[in-house]
């Protein structure tokens, strides 16, 4: 899977969208590695 910063950011945005934004406050691109997905 793509693990560039841009891929991580877009994947996280999708996850936030699907979850309705109900995730931890520190669940942001710069805190999340590709393995979190």
């Amino acid at each position: 899977a793509c693990d560039t910063a841009t891929c991580v950011t877009h994947r996280l945005a999708g996850l936030l969208s699907r979850s309705g934004g109900v995730v931890k406050n520190n669940f942001v691109p710069t805190n999340v590695g590709s393995k979190a997905f």
């Epitope: 560039t4 942001v28 710069t30």
Partner: antibody, heavy 119, light 107 residues
């Protein structure tokens, strides 16, 4: 409103260095990666590198062979791109850019900084 | 580095025309492609990410498709404000790379 505001135009001599700043506002600066991209006159866009402002880890385009250094000042929500050993081919517009999720999911770009390298 | 080859390099079109721009990657980049619009003297404006998703505020006449190595940006009905240069970008691997651009000109 998310904004990326860059420093003003620079004129440099060959062999000198230039440091361009990018002041971020309207979002949490440390939450999102910052990219630097340049565009020489009439040329395609060229990615230079990015930085994670949270842990200050950088990734660079090896084309620049150690000439580029990206840094941040977290307290000032500002990113910097320094390019050393300037040559005429480095004459370009330099942009900072960041993909933000909150408050608005978008790929934001600074207004650009023109760097002219001339003897 | 991954090469992104755009075609055509320029296209002349009229308001209301359908315009298609293609981008070919030198190796598989999945769906990790973005499209940008740039007007003279201005910063690039993001249109599409992940090959086919429009950013909020981008008109629905812009659409993207493709995966792997072949990608397309389509403007379904060209508007006066759409005359600009368009760039594709791959962000599947470092360094990110851009296509050479397609200039959409008034016929």
């Amino acid at each position: 409103e998310v904004q990326l505001v860059q420093s003003g135009a620079e004129v440099k001599k060959p062999g000198a260095s230039v440091k361009v700043s990018c002041k971020a506002s309207g979002y949490t600066f440390t939450d999102y990666y910052m990219n630097w991209v340049r565009q020489a006159p009439g040329q395609r866009l060229e990615w230079m590198g990015d930085i994670n402002p949270n842990n200050v880890v950088t990734t660079y385009n090896q084309k620049f062979k150690g000439r580029v250094t990206i840094t941040v000042d977290k307290s000032a929500s500002t990113a910097y791109m320094e390019l050393s050993s300037l040559r005429s081919e480095d004459t370009a517009v330099y942009y900072c850019a960041s993909i933000i999720i909150v408050p608005d999911y978008f790929d934001y770009w600074g207004q650009g900084t023109t760097v002219t390298v001339s003897s | 580095d991954i090469q992104m080859t755009q075609s055509p390099s320029s296209v002349s079109a009229s308001v209301g025309d359908r315009v298609t721009i293609t981008c070919k990657a030198s190796q598989n980049v999945g769906s990790n492609v973005a499209w940008y619009q740039q007007k003279p003297g201005k910063s690039p404006k993001a249109l599409i990410y992940s090959a086919s998703y429009r950013y909020s505020g981008v008109p629905s006449r812009f659409s993207g498709s493709g995966s792997g190595t072949d990608f397309t940006l389509t403007i379904s009905s060209l508007q006066p404000e759409d005359f600009a240069t368009y760039y594709c970008q791959q962000y599947n691997s470092y360094p990110y790379t851009f296509g050479g651009g397609t200039k959409v000109e008034i016929k």
